[in-house]
Amino acid sequence: MRRGPRSLRGRDAPAPTPCVPAECFDLLVRHCVACGLLRTARPKPAGASSPAPRTALQPQE
């Protein structure tokens, strides 16, 4: 059985990730994790600075 592509890449879509569709790619640690482990940053207190939110690339079929 030939393996199909992990994701379909649109013109402006991010590059395909090595994750199966059941997982998401964590850009922070650079590996696949359960998508529920990816959280956007909590709202920051007024005047405080914080790192960019954690994001993921998720393949779609």
């Epitope: 059985m1 393996r3 090595p18 994750c19 199966v20 569709p21 059941a22 998401c24 590996h31 696949c32 359960a34 998508c35 529920g36 482990l37 990816l38 994001t55 993921a56 998720q58 779609q60 079929e61």
Partner: antibody, heavy 118, light 113 residues
């Protein structure tokens, strides 16, 4: 056609060890995550963990309920992956299934039965 | 761990009837970045291994009859069989794969009258 065949089940005494095998055919073994799931007699399913594919360095995830006692590994040259079970308990008695992970647990083997009893 | 609760635990219906079964999760399974719900449904016929029916809560697996429909979002999900056939006799399990450990519901046993 995807085919998964488990083996290695049987009767083992409490405290003993057992290694289950899952023989894979019909797809490129290095390209897929593989998982183990168990089902005690007459009960629901319990996910034990999985091993990722080559692109992800064959990293693993485990259910905390078995982490430290169970180890998932793979022999890609023979298209087999394994579940090593140590310090077995009566509550580990179940049918053990291997499954291919892609969109969810996509394909399952027929299962192998493990009985832990003195 | 996310707790998956299924209801009813069993039901008996006649061939041709419509069936709905429920699955509730203890936390949302919706990943907002892609709007996918990480919820799957499996069918386990007597003496057989489970078979994937539905993934992402509502996407039917290839080869699964269109009488099986998954719906819902967040924490409340439903599997509907539009017109039950005798061959649908099975236990149906929902499972979340939103986070580790993946967890299953206790199952709904479908019996045919």
């Amino acid at each position: 056609e995807v085919k998964l065949v488990e083996s290695g089940g049987g009767l083992v005494q409490p405290g003993g060890s057992l290694r289950l095998s899952c023989a894979i055919s019909g797809f490129t073994v290095t390209a897929y995550y593989m998982s183990w799931v168990r089902q005690p007699p007459g009960k629901a399913l319990e996910w034990l963990g999985f091993i990722r594919d080559k692109a992800n360095g064959y990293t693993t995830e485990y259910n905390p309920s078995v982490k430290g006692r169970f180890t998932i590994s793979r022999d890609n040259s023979q298209s087999i992956f394994y579940l090593q079970m140590n310090t077995l308990r009566a509550e580990d008695s179940a049918t053990y299934y291997c499954a291919q992970v892609r969109r969810a647990l996509d394909y399952w083997g027929q299962g192998t039965t493990v009985t832990v009893s003195a | 761990d996310i707790v998956m609760s299924q209801s009813p635990s069993s039901l008996a219906v006649s061939v041709g009837e419509k069936v709905t079964m429920s699955c509730k999760s203890s936390q949302s399974l919706l990943y907002s970045s892609n709007q996918n719900n990480y919820l799957a449904w499996y069918q386990q016929k007597p003496g057989q291994s489970p078979k994937l029916l539905i993934y992402w809560a509502s996407t039917r697996e290839s080869g699964v009859p269109d009488r099986f429909t998954g719906s819902g979002s967040g924490t409340d999900f439903t599997l509907t069989i539009s017109s039950v056939k005798a061959e649908d006799l099975a236990v149906y399990y929902c499972q979340q794969y939103y986070t580790y450990p993946y967890t299953f519901g206790g199952g709904t046993k479908l019996e045919i009258k």
